[in-house]
């Protein structure tokens, strides 16, 4: 029986041009994590395998960094990075656990404008 649960950073936002850490954590199970896949809307971002280490998809190599831990760091964010991200934990003997994170990338100029021209 699968007893584990995935805790994620949930819904997060970040500024265009900045970076963000995507984190998932598997708890409440003694299952061994053999591999974690990071995906964005039917695209492979990266894989961390217990034996082979990290593989970053070639199209994301310039903007994705492995870690910290089993997490993933997205850099040089664009508005197009807004969307759902999934961490898929492959475990033995439990099977597969999936966590979801929603990232919203905000126009930095809009954020600055809002902060700069607030009415007291």
């Amino acid at each position: 029986m699968m007893t584990g649960t995935i805790e994620t950073t949930g819904n997060i936002s970040a500024e265009k041009g900045g970076s963000i850490i995507l984190q998932c954590h598997l708890s409440s199970t003694t299952a061994q994590v053999t591999q974690v896949n990071w995906e964005q809307q039917d695209q492979l971002l990266a894989i961390c395998n217990a034996d082979l280490g990290w593989h970053i998809s070639p199209s994301f190599k310039d903007r994705v960094a492995p870690g910290p831990g089993l997490g993933l760091t997205l850099q040089s964010l664009t508005v197009n990075d807004t969307g759902e991200y999934f961490c898929i934990y492959h475990t033995y003997p439990d099977g597969t656990y999936t966590g979801r994170i929603f990232l919203e990338v905000l126009e930095s100029s809009v954020a600055e404008h809002g902060a700069r021209f607030q009415i007291p």
Epitope: Q35, E39, D42, Q43, L44, I47, N49, D51, L52, H55, S57, S59, H90, Y92
Partner: antibody
Framework: EVQLLESGGGLVQPGGSLRLSCAAS????????MHWVRQAPGKGLEWVSA????????SYADSVKGRFTISRDNSKNTLYLQMNSLRAEDTAVYYC???????????WGQGTLVTVSS | DIQMTQSPSSLSASVGDRVTITCRAS??????LNWYQQKPGKAPKLLIY???SLQSGVPSRFSGSGSGTDFTLTISSLQPEDFATYYC?????????FGGGTKVEIK
């Protein structure tokens, strides 16, 4: 340089047995899942079987389930396929392939021909 | 089992042509789609993995796209050494399955 070298193929009568081997070199064999894929003469590719890195789990195509057994010896860097109760339709070139991250087959052996005929 | 349907089964093209091969899965397979090239008497060679990632050492004229059920392999400018048979393969679930192949011949 990654190398996979299959051996053990040959001519066998229907109902007979063969054991194929795949000798691996040039990489850390014990870190990779390994698969067998076959190709009948003039036909397409058919997946046969897979085994994970530590031999803890394996899977088979329905066409060979109960007749073929995949195994590996990580101390010898060798993958095996024990084929029993062979049928004419098992006639094919058998390839072993390395499968990193369980998703793609990045290196293949040159293949070994198995012919089942009376 | 997931069925993989490739089209066309064969095509004739000239050096320099743009060639497109399609592969359709019988159910959604996300990005779990790979493309291989095979020449007569040789083992298959990985070209594209995870739908769109170019395997190291493969020329950039090869590209892959798609997700879910519909995928495409494109050769932007066909070269003499590209005349071969191409297979798609899903690794979403076992049994792993291949498309029937597309033979690219010289026109």
């Amino acid at each position: 340089e990654v190398q996979l070298l299959e051996s053990g193929g040959g001519l066998v009568q229907p109902g007979g047995s063969l054991r194929l081997s795949c000798a691996a070199s040039g990489f850390t064999f014990s870190s990779y899942s390994m698969h067998w894929v076959r190709q009948a003469p003039g036909k397409g590719l058919e997946w046969v079987s897979a085994i994970n890195s530590n031999a803890g789990s394996s899977s088979y195509a329905d066409s060979v389930k109960g007749r073929f057994t995949i195994s590996r010896d990580n101390s010898k860097n060798t993958l095996y396929l024990q084929m029993n109760s062979l049928r004419a339709e098992d006639t094919a070139v058998y390839y072993c392939a390395r499968v990193p991250y369980g998703v793609w087959m990045d290196y293949w052996g040159q293949g070994t021909l198995v012919t089942v005929s009376s | 089992d997931i069925q993989m349907t490739q089209s066309p089964s064969s095509l004739s093209a000239s050096v320099g042509d743009r060639v497109t091969i399609t592969c359709r899965a019988s159910q959604s397979i996300s990005y779990y789609l790979n493309w291989y090239q095979q020449k007569p008497g040789k083992a298959p060679k990985l070209l594209i993995y995870a739908a769109s990632s170019l395997q190291s050492g493969v020329p950039s004229r090869f590209s892959g796209s798609g997700s879910g059920t519909d995928f495409t392999l494109t050769i932007s400018s066909l070269q003499p050494e590209d005349f071969a048979t191409y297979y798609c393969q899903q690794s979403y679930s076992t049994p792993l399955t291949f498309g029937g192949g597309t033979k690219v011949e010289i026109k």
